[in-house]
Interface confidence: low
């Protein structure tokens, strides 16, 4: 377990000409907070995917104006870093996503608007303990200046916080000094490497190296039974001369931490190691409530129904996720009908609609056919936003009006020859040939070769030709 | 400009009621946690309750655990504090303050008070 | 519940001193996943409303002069004003906020 710390320096213009426009205005004075997104590995994932290691949000920024038409300065910051802790091992290898968001506090009905400045991403690679390291990312024409770390959490230790658990040697609760393995609550930690030959069953260590005796047991290794008329310490373990301790009630005997925290003995009482999302004495609260503001992009917060559950954001159309980050694109639903173009504008979803057609979606076909009329006995077809006259046999063009030449197009086949016909066309086949078009040559013994029947079909069965 | 200006209070005799409002302007109301403090004729400082910026949420001490109620109206902008079995030692001036931010912030905003007595 | 005790009680001070008070916790107010001890020192003039001066143990809130310093973590605190001016005088409250909300009894600040 362990904590991933990240610490913004600076927000604002980066290095060179096209510098933005401050975001806040002394119309609309707003405040920056960060979302910080760690994934586990190098992988080019997606923004949307799941912050598998966790995320944070910032506290919000003092609140800026800036006076109009004046170029953006770096921005005021939020308080304190941004604190991503971790259950497990720290991976080593991850990737990051860091956003700026704006909270704009002018008199917007429903509360704050909030909007995404700049997001950067990155992959790293960082071992837990090591210094902070330092790094500029620029979006846009943005430029975030940050460093980051990760630490481990007592008593994890080395560069990927891991910690060893075994099974528990008593029922009721872990040796001296020893927490139990959340979630595992059926182990216990591993102590710690300690000095050779200290004894496995009544000796423990809190440091590399050293060796103190559990409750009975003395000696440089905890191998020499005491008597308990020895005892100097009311409880708890002893130095390893008097090696003994007489039991009595601890502190964290019940486990008073709620909500999964694991109990560690203080001098004065207790402490509760909370899991995320908990916090206070006992890890009896949650650590984030709708108070903080977690729903983004105007998403309605809701507290849970009793005091430990979790707040829940309802997002508003086109936005997802557990804390309405994600943008839906909603346009890949294919919303608008008869090849209407999508057009998603975040507020609200626009269609932009073919002639021919209307309506929020392109639902509405127009009469294309009214008022129009085909001549010489044509009729109106209507489709594709556009009328279109299907004419009489001997005329053609758009609306009927223009006589038609049946022969113009060469409809017949293998040279045969076209004769316009009150009725149509006729084509004389020339030798070899047959069909309304001439398009099947006659074999020599007479038979015409029709079209080959399908895979399956068998050649009787003509009306399923294809 | 935050404002916060605290009304209703008065004197009554143990065991009676009284509610107090708390009129917000000037900022997003509904974004913030807010709590009623009380100050003690000695000059001692007793927070009472407090409330989640939704509503959602109430935290007491429990010494007026079942008998104040908090609750907030975030359409009207106004906080309110329903106080009944009321005893002597509730006496004091009445403060509603506003949180930085959640429950868990220290409080940046607090009204003038408003008065509440209990005797018979 | 934890407690906060403030000392001293109260304190006579001539303009331009440097003061120090001190607030105790019952136990700790560092809160570990984030390294942030939940305690802020309030300033209470006569006649007035309490108003905030440091929240997290040591950010002074804007508008707060410079002057006031808040330190310490776990259970000791201090509020630091390095030349007091006599509108400092008032009486200065500590109060947690790591697990419901507590305030110390106050330390008076008066002139000498």
């Known amino acids: 377990a362990g904590v991933f710390e990240l610490q913004i320096h600076s927000f604002g213009p980066g290095p060179g000409p096209g510098a933005p426009r401050s975001p806040c205005s002394a119309r609309l004075p707003c405040r920056l907070f960060f979302r910080v997104c760690l994934k586990p590995g190098l992988s080019e994932e997606a923004a949307e995917s799941p912050c598998a290691l966790g995320a944070a949000l910032s506290a919000r920024g003092p609140v800026y104006t800036e006076q109009p038409g004046a170029p953006a300065p770096d921005l005021p910051l939020p308080d304190g870093l941004l604190q991503v802790p971790f259950r497990d091992a720290w991976p080593g290898t991850f990737s990051f996503i860091i956003e700026t968001w704006r909270e704009e506090l002018g008199d917007q009905i429903g509360g704050p608007a909030w909007s995404l400045l700049a997001r950067v991403a990155g992959r790293r690679r960082l071992a837990a303990g090591g210094p902070w390291a330092r790094d500029i990312q620029r979006a846009g024409a943005w430029e975030l200046r940050f460093s980051y770390r990760a630490r481990c959490e007592p008593p994890a230790v080395g560069t990927a916080c891991t910690r060893l658990c075994r099974p528990r040697s008593a029922p009721s609760r872990c040796g001296p000094g020893l927490r139990p393995c959340a979630p595992l609550e059926d182990e216990c930690e591993a102590p710690l490497v300690c000095r050779a030959g200290c004894s496995p069953e009544h000796g423990f260590c809190e440091q590399p190296g050293e060796c103190r005796c559990l409750e009975g047991w003395t000696g440089p290794l905890c191998t020499v039974p005491v008597s308990t008329s020895s005892c100097l310490s009311p409880r708890g373990p002893s130095s390893a001369t008097t090696g003994c301790l007489v039991p009595g009630p601890g502190p964290c005997d019940g486990n008073p931490c709620a909500n999964g925290g694991s109990c560690s003995e203080t001098p004065r009482s207790f402490e509760c190691t909370c899991p995320r999302g908990f916090y206070g004495l006992r890890c009896e609260v949650s650590g984030v409530t709708c108070a903080d503001g977690p729903c983004f992009n105007g998403g309605l917060c809701v507290g849970g129904a009793d005091p430990d559950s979790a707040y829940i954001c309802h997002c508003p159309p086109g936005f997802q996720g557990s804390n309405c980050e994600k943008r839906v694109d909603r346009c890949s639903l294919q919303p608008c009908r008869n090849g209407g173009l999508c057009l998603d504008l975040g507020h609200a979803l626009r269609c932009r609609c073919r002639a021919g057609f209307a309506g929020p979606r392109c639902e509405h076909d127009l009469d294309d056919c009214a008022g129009r009329a085909c001549a010489n006995g044509g009729t109106c077809v209507e489709g594709g936003g556009a009328h279109r006259c299907s004419c009489a046999l001997g005329f053609g063009g758009r609306d009927c009006r223009e006589r038609a030449d049946p022969c113009a197009a060469r409809p017949c086949a293998h040279g045969g020859r076209c004769y316009a016909h009150f009725s149509g066309l006729v084509c004389a086949c020339a030798p070899g040939y047959m069909g309304a078009r001439c398009e099947f040559p006659v074999h020599p013994d007479g038979a015409s070769a029709l079209p080959a029947a399908p895979p399956g079909l068998r050649p009787g069965d003509p009306q399923r030709y294809l | 400009e935050v404002q916060l200006v605290e009304s209703g209070g008065g004197l009554v005799k143990p065991g009676g009621s009284l509610k107090l409002s708390c009129a917000a302007s000037g900022f997003t109301f509904s974004s913030y946690a807010m709590s009623w403090v009380r100050q003690t004729p000695e000059k001692r400082l007793e927070w009472v309750a407090a409330i989640n910026s939704n509503g959602g949420r109430n935290y007491y001490p429990d010494t007026v655990k079942d008998r104040f109620t908090i609750s907030r109206d975030n359409a009207k902008n106004t906080l309110y504090l329903q106080m009944s079995s009321l005893r002597s030692e509730d006496t004091a001036l009445y403060y509603c303050?506003?949180?930085?931010?959640?429950?868990?912030?220290?409080?940046?905003?607090w009204g003038q008070g408003t008065s509440v007595t209990v005797s018979s | 519940d934890i407690v906060m005790s403030q000392s001293p009680s109260s304190l006579a001070v001539s303009v331009g001193e440097k003061v120090t008070m001190s607030c105790k916790s019952s136990?700790?107010?560092?809160?570990?996943?984030?390294?942030?001890?939940?305690l802020a020192w309030y300033q209470q003039k006569p006649g007035q409303s309490p108003k905030l001066l440091i929240y997290?143990?040591?950010t002074r809130e804007s508008g707060v002069p410079d002057r006031f310093t808040g330190s310490g973590s776990g259970t000791d605190f201090t509020l630091t004003i390095s030349s007091v001016k006599a509108e400092d005088l008032a009486v200065y409250y500590c109060q947690q906020y790591y697990t419901y909300l507590t305030f110390g009894a106050g330390t008076k600040l008066e002139l000498k």
């Open positions: 136990q700790s107010l560092l809160y570990s996943s984030n390294q942030k001890n939940y």
């Open positions: 997290w143990a040591s």
């Open positions: 303050a506003r949180h930085r931010g959640g429950y868990y912030y220290a409080m940046d905003y």
